[in-house]
Amino acid sequence: RGVFRRDAHKSEVAHRFKDLGEENFKALVLIAFAQYLQQCPFEDHVKLVNEVTEFAKTCVADESAENCDKSLHTLFGDKLCTVATLRETYGEMADCCAKQEPERNECFLQHKDDNPNLPRLVRPEVDVMCTAFHDNEETFLKKYLYEIARRHPYFYAPELLFFAKRYKAAFTECCQAADKAACLLPKLDELRDEGKASSAKQRLKCASLQKFGERAFKAWAVARLSQRFPKAEFAEVSKLVTDLTKVHTECCHGDLLECADDRADLAKYICENQDSISSKLKECCEKPLLEKSHCIAEVENDEMPADLPSLAADFVESKDVCKNYAEAKDVFLGMFLYEYARRHPDYSVVLLLRLAKTYETTLEKCCAAADPHECYAKVFDEFKPLVEEPQNLIKQNCELFEQLGEYKFQNALLVRYTKKVPQVSTPTLVEVSRNLGKVGSKCCKHPEAKRMPCAEDYLSVVLNQLCVLHEKTPVSDRVTKCCTESLVNRRPCFSALEVDETYVPKEFNAETFTFHADICTLSEKERQIKKQTALVELVKHKPKATKEQLKAVMDDFAAFVEKCCKADDKETCFAEEGKKLVAASQAALGL
């Protein structure tokens, strides 16, 4: 089976059940339902999944049975629309049920909430978790899928199956260990952090497809796969891009069974043809399916062929450039992107796409000119500033990170971004700036050749978080402009923003800067978030405050927290010293 199976199936649900097996089928239907109805209780979803599974089994037994010929969207949509509390829980989303397919599914997709109003997941004691795991392993693992899926409605479903497999393995191993907590907690922390990163990466892929279209996603995929598989032929890369686009289009569109099935087919194809693709795939291809697919997605770049010729000859110096471009524009531009990307694993994907866009714009202009060759002869010179801009930015920011460390680097970014877009909500600014700040520890340790792809492509993922959160409640025209004008220029757009001079400072509210003894029991991370929240609020009150003023206030604040957390009567200390701190801060900032 290729990724594009053209063989008709009488029953799509039976086909997918047989391809995926009962366990994966049930898990994927649960993920799909939880990503659509994010507020529904776990038990309700399990009931719906069991009903769908029983129905699928009847179709496997007899594909001609009643309703077995219906599309998966029809079957799943009908099932979701049986939820009794749909109107009360979801409001206008209930109106989706009055629509016919495919409009009904589109309606459900539009109501996916990137920031659902759900309680933070609190991790129980290790013994409590191990007891729950042993008492009912199946329910325990389903609960994991449900809780992640409803909080991350665009999580890459087949990859979530891989996370669940690792989650199960962690409990299986650690609940038997002498020191359960020492074994389990680091593994759960790692899964949580990797899961958040995976969710954010997939969110960018879905945004790329949904907001900028298939061509934008395909261009991204050509660049990335050409860097990863520089020995592969252009047609091989093109085939992988076409198949990968289909997989991600399906997952982003809620077609999770098709997506998982096609992803498995793609992994199979890659492994069967690894000699033509990459020398780095051998280990991945020896793994079981879920591990194999994950491994392929993360595989390191293959070595570049030694004898690659100069690009200038055929893409700039040749008199046939316009003829070749006119013959098949997208193939010619695709080849340009492929050839440039496989030579530049040291560039970010977004930079490669900017270069391709510049090249395309130049050809569009020059091929209509009197002397096309003269016109496009210097096109590669236009690339220089585009390459130098991210290089310089990364150099400066890595120097700043090395000087400050992660926490203070995050604070510098908090101040920078709050001044750029002060209308954005404080929790969003804190979350996004903290993630932007993590670029330092993630990428600055790398040698020069790996810094840009690490940093700029990571920043694209984080800025997309800002874009999707802002889209839900738009408050800043500048954010909207940077998010919607060009996918590849989002980071340069945000970098170029200066202080928003139109912003009217927020009224001072002492309550915002009132702290209590509960801060002392928080983890270091939670305490940092409290301090960073205060910092954002300070900048919103006094956007013209200097770095020195803000540093002085934050140092005083840190000393105040440390002092009161050591006091015998903590609450009294926070009340009395807090008033003094607020007064001193107001004076220091001229509030």
Partner: nanobody, 125 residues
Framework: EVQLLESGGGLVQPGGSLRLSCAAS????????MGWFRQAPGKEREGVSS????????FYTNSVKGRFTISRDNSKNTLYLQMNSLRPEDTAVYYC??????????????????WGQGTLVTVSS
């Protein structure tokens, strides 16, 4: 429509060299991926080497790497295959093929759209 005409085949001793040529005519953009294939008696046709006439990237099957070199002269619309250190197992009919770079894959002859008639290379002492 595209026409391809190979030349340069012949009898050569093991360790010797040959240079094959392939002249292309017609809509040359349709031939911006060009390759050499070979078919030994009783065996399937296999890819030897390919080149993009835009970009100049080259690809070789493992058994000929370091011995064969593909090149092209765009001004003459001609493809070449320089074969050195020839071995008896290189004996085959060598075909020139062309197609779209978005489709052509050296391991799959069906992805090439245009074919020459072939030229015989015999390596024997």
């Amino acid at each position: 429509e595209v026409q391809l005409l190979e030349s340069g085949g012949g009898l050569v001793q093991p360790g010797g060299s040959l240079r094959l040529s392939c002249a292309a005519s017609g809509n040359t953009y349709l031939t911006s991926c060009m390759g050499w294939f070979r078919q030994a008696p009783g065996k399937e046709r296999e890819g030897v080497s390919s080149i993009y006439t835009v970009g100049g990237s080259t690809f070789y099957t493992n058994s000929v790497k370091g011995r064969f070199t593909i090149s092209r002269d765009n001004s003459k619309n001609t493809l070449y295959l320089q074969m050195n250190s020839l071995r008896p197992e290189d004996t085959a009919v060598y075909y020139c093929a062309a197609g779209s770079p978005a489709r052509c894959r050296l391991r799959d002859p069906t992805t090439f759209d245009y074919w020459g008639q072939g030229t015989l290379v015999t390596v024997s002492s």
